[in-house]
Amino acid sequence: HNTTVFQGVAGQSLQVSCPYDSMKHWGRRKAWCRQLGEKGPCQRVVSTHNLWLLSFLRRWNGSTAITDDTLGGTLTITLRNLQPHDAGLYQCQSLHGSEADTLRKVLVEVLADPLDHRDAGDLWFPGESESFEDAHVEHSISRSLLEGEIPFPPTS
């Protein structure tokens, strides 16, 4: 899986979208999890409604919401009141039994509020960008991460 970078601004909301094949994942609940450490598990943050037919209903866990357009094939996660500690590597998952398929790997970056910037010429607008082409970077971030190996945060 490539990793997609989503950049948001501290104090604001960030919407993360995870497209998927609606037929292939028909009837499956979805989840949003956070990668704990370089080789740690992906810890569940929030999942869609227990009844798949009600997946369109927004479910919250703290400041994170999830909703699933099962016909259009788009899972949407909203991170409200984004803070620096929300930065991290996440996954959108499709659940089947005790297994989880990764729909998308997402790197969330939290930037300082651009309204604080003194030099408007330096402003640039956060959003979504596909992971970079550099094969080494891709490999270093997209390799298989095994559960339970290194607790977060990793030690040197």
């Epitope: 970078v5 990668q35 803070q83 620096p84 590597l89 300082a112 270093s140 945060p153 030690t155």
Partner: antibody, heavy 121, light 107 residues
Framework: QVQLVQSGAEVKKPGASVKVSCKAS????????IHWVRQAPGQGLEWMGW????????TSAQKFQGRVTMTRDTSTSSAYMELSRLRSDDTAVYYC??????????????WGQGTLVTVSS | DIQMTQSPSSLSASVGDRVTITCRAS??????LAWYQQKPGKAPKSLIY???SLQSGVPSRFSGSGSGTDFTLTISSLQPEDFATYYC?????????FGQGTKVDIK
């Protein structure tokens, strides 16, 4: 072991720019943010900002907006901090430091040895 | 910006003493607090993250506690190599800010 090695001391004139390098080794460079912190002579620590070596994304403290540019070169596992329009009060030791969190912001764990930048006419 | 206030600014202690340094944030920062040790002419060394978790390789005589606005760094039995300046830092809100430092010297 994880190590950050910085470039040597610099002497600059007011109005000039300085570029400090920070070469990482012993870990996956693109997996951990690099912070820049400075310390004026006899003073405390001041956070300047960070760069995410994976994406190249940066954020800096308002005080340095428009003057600081943070970049990285993944091929050499190096991060760079350039400060422009130098003033005498920019005289300080500049440190790079690795964040402890994997692609996250979790406080720093390893620091470079520091680079003394002296601004004097 | 969040102001981090350390107290005392300096203290004199003897080897074997129990030393406590406090750090107060001007607003709540949960447990997003780190502690650092710095010796003259050297780079800071990370001691504690997440208010109370010890960094790898740091002696167990160092401990941290607190949450919200009030935090404490404790050295249970001061050793000769512990004479240094200690800084707290919050990483809850931009810009990340440090306390002004607490210098621990020999009595």
């Amino acid at each position: 072991q994880v190590q950050l090695v910085q470039s040597g001391a610099e002497v600059k004139k007011p109005g000039a720019s300085v570029k400090v390098s920070c070469k990482a080794s012993g870990y996956t460079f693109t997996g951990y943010y690099i912070h820049w912190v400075r310390q004026a002579p006899g003073q405390g620590l001041e956070w300047m900002g960070w760069i995410n070596p994976y994406s190249g994304g940066t954020t800096s403290a308002q005080k340095f907006q428009g003057r600081v540019t943070m970049t990285r070169d993944t091929s050499t596992s190096s991060a760079y901090m350039e400060l422009s329009r130098l003033r005498s009060d920019d005289t300080a030791v500049y440190y790079c430091a690795r964040d402890a969190g994997y692609l996250a912001l979790y406080g720093t764990d390893v620091w470079g040895q520091g680079t003394l930048v002296t601004v004097s006419s | 910006d969040i102001q981090m206030t350390q107290s005392p600014s300096s203290l004199s202690a003897s080897v074997g003493d129990r030393v406590t340094i406090t750090c107060r944030a001007s607003q709540g920062i949960s447990n997003y607090l780190a502690w650092y040790q710095q010796k003259p002419g050297k780079a800071p060394k990370s001691l504690i993250y997440a208010a109370s978790s010890l960094q790898s390789g740091v002696p167990s005589r160092f401990s941290g506690s607190g949450s919200g606005t009030d935090f404490t760094l404790t050295i249970s039995s001061l050793q000769p190599e512990d004479f240094a300046t200690y800084y707290c830092q919050q990483y809850s809100t931009y810009p990340f800010t440090f306390g002004q430092g607490t210098k621990v010297d020999i009595k």
